[in-house]
Structure formats: structure tokens, C-alpha cells
């Protein structure tokens, strides 16, 4: 028979032969042959593989570094990685939770809608037209543009979401 060019699900092609992939939690020791099955071995104590695979090395479980404020939320198994979370009152910097912050700041152009608590991080909102924020802050709201009219001045430079308007003197030459 013709050697296969594609294999079934949970198989891989090697030496013109379809071999079974190793199941999650196991790594490849040796490929199958015409006479033998694929040989797989369970991952070690602090290792895992989360897919059907032909990996010769298992992945190390993630380390939740207490020096970064991390602790184990869910212990890893041979098939799953460890899930880290932050100490109480701290917040993950990303979905992968690789480090912790007390709270995040809102960038220029955004204001604080809600200050962080022990449970929820800072909630930011874009500054609407007529308001601005020129700082990175975890407490400051968007500030309204200066009203030049109330100071008997005129707008010399329009405001943006990151900058205030610039006021200047009235043009006295106008009729």
C-alpha cells in the first residue's frame, strides 16, 4: 500500500508512517515503528503537557513568585499549568498574571471613573469632548477645559482629551 501523506486526529506522520500522539500529561520517548506503538512517559512532579503531543520534554509549571506578590490559585497537574493570582488587595498586570500591582493608573486622555478597591482595579474612562487629563493617575478624573470666556479671553488653541485649551487676549481691533 501507498505510504500515507496525512494521518488521523491524534496521530502524526513520521518515516512515512502514522504514529499515535502522546496523551496530555505524557511526553514522547520514542516514535512508533512498523512493529511497535509510540512510547510515552508521564511528566514529572512539577511538569505538564496540556495537549496531545509529540514533545520530548514536558513544560515546567509556572512559579508563582511571592517576591512579586504572587500566590498559587490553582496547583498544576500533569495536564495543566499552575495558575497564579495576586495577594489580597493586589491586581494582576495581565491575564497571565505574571506580576502584581496595587492598582493601575489611567493614561493621559483618560480619567478615573472608579478608584481601585481590594476587590476591583481602577476603572478608567476616556475624557469626553470638553474635558482633558494630561497625567497618568489612579485617582484624578478628567478636568473640564478652562472657560476662556469667563476670564474675558478667547481660545487661542483648542483643547484635546490630553490638553487644556490655551486662552489669549481678545483682539482689540475688531469692530
Amino acid at each position: 500500500p501507498e505510504p500515507p501523506t496525512a494521518c488521523r486526529e491524534k496521530q502524526y506522520l513520521i518515516n512515512s508512517q502514522c504514529c499515535s500522539l502522546c496523551q496530555p500529561g505524557q511526553k514522547l520517548v520514542s516514535d512508533c515503528t512498523e512493529f511497535t506503538e509510540t512510547e510515552c512517559l508521564p511528566c514529572g512532579e512539577s511538569e505538564f503537557l496540556d495537549t496531545w503531543n509529540r514533545e520530548t520534554h514536558c513544560h515546567q509549571h509556572k512559579y508563582c513568585d511571592p517576591n512579586l506578590g504572587l500566590r498559587v490559585q490553582q496547583k498544576g497537574t500533569s495536564e495543566t499549568d499552575t495558575i497564579c493570582t495576586c495577594e489580597e488587595g493586589w491586581h494582576c498586570t495581565s491575564e497571565a498574571c505574571e506580576s502584581c500591582v496595587l492598582h493601575r493608573s489611567c493614561s493621559p486622555g483618560f480619567g478615573v471613573k472608579q478608584i481601585a478597591t481590594g476587590v476591583s482595579d481602577t476603572i478608567c474612562e476616556p475624557c469626553p469632548v470638553g474635558f482633558f487629563s494630561n497625567v497618568s493617575s489612579a485617582f484624578e478624573k478628567c478636568h473640564p477645559w478652562t472657560s476662556c470666556e469667563t476670564k474675558d479671553l478667547v481660545v487661542q488653541q483648542a483643547g484635546t482629551n490630553k490638553t487644556d485649551v490655551v486662552c489669549g487676549p481678545q483682539d482689540r481691533l475688531r469692530a
Epitope: 512579586l68 500591582v101 496595587l102 492598582h103 493601575r104 497625567v135 485617582f139
Partner: nanobody, 116 residues
Framework: EVQLLESGGGLVQPGGSLRLSCAAS???????EMWWVRQAPGKGLERVS?????????YYADSVKGRFTISRDNSKNTLYLQMNSLRAEDTAVYHC?????????WGQGTLVTVSS
């Protein structure tokens, strides 16, 4: 290396006052918003007060409004928290914090105990 060193804590009677300091080094102090955060024994973190880099904007938690005053001296790279009319529930370790507020900037804090 960023360093934040809190001081000024101690034992005080209810109704008394204390002034906490936070000496900052390793960064351009005036360019950063700063916070005071406290942790009471067996409790979570509470964000107490914050001040903008220039000192022009401040924030106070409802629990301390009217009693605590945050300030900064950018020429001395120092943050302050003046605490008046202290109550038993103000007992906590007080920490100062700077953006980006990461855990590895977290100092030892200074312990404030309000008791008669």
C-alpha cells in the same frame, strides 16, 4: 534603585495626632503621583490618600476625610501624612506607594497603633 522608606509611626491615644513621612529615592520624585495605603491587622489593604506630582490634586478615603492631610515636599523628595483625631480603627501598617505601584516597590511600612 527605587526606595520608599516610611517613618513616624508609633503608639498614640485616641484623639491624638501623628505625622508620617515617606523618604523617596531612586526616581524623579516630583514626576510621580504618590499614595498612602494601610493594612490593619488581619484586614485587607485600604487606599487612604493620594497626591499628584505637583501636589495640586489630592484624594482622601471617606474614612479619613477631614482628619488626615496628605502633602509633599518635592525639594526634599518626601511625602507626608498628617493624621489628626486618631481612632482605634486607624490602627494599621501605613505604606507609601508610587506608580506603577508594583509589589516589588512595596516597603516595610510604619506601624500606627491607636490605643488608650
Amino acid at each position: 534603585e527605587v526606595q520608599l522608606l516610611e517613618s513616624g509611626g508609633g503608639l498614640v491615644q485616641p484623639g491624638g495626632s501623628l505625622r508620617l513621612s515617606c523618604a523617596a529615592s531612586g526616581f524623579t520624585f516630583a514626576g510621580y503621583e504618590m499614595w498612602w495605603v494601610r493594612q490593619a491587622p488581619g484586614k485587607g489593604l485600604e487606599r487612604v490618600s493620594a497626591i499628584s506630582g505637583s501636589g495640586g490634586s489630592t484624594y482622601y478615603a471617606d474614612s479619613v476625610k477631614g482628619r488626615f492631610t496628605i502633602s509633599r515636599d518635592n525639594s526634599k523628595n518626601t511625602l507626608y501624612l498628617q493624621m489628626n483625631s486618631l481612632r482605634a480603627e486607624d490602627t494599621a501598617v501605613y505604606h507609601c506607594a508610587k506608580e506603577p505601584y508594583s509589589y516589588d516597590y512595596w516597603g516595610q511600612g510604619t506601624l500606627v497603633t491607636v490605643s488608650s
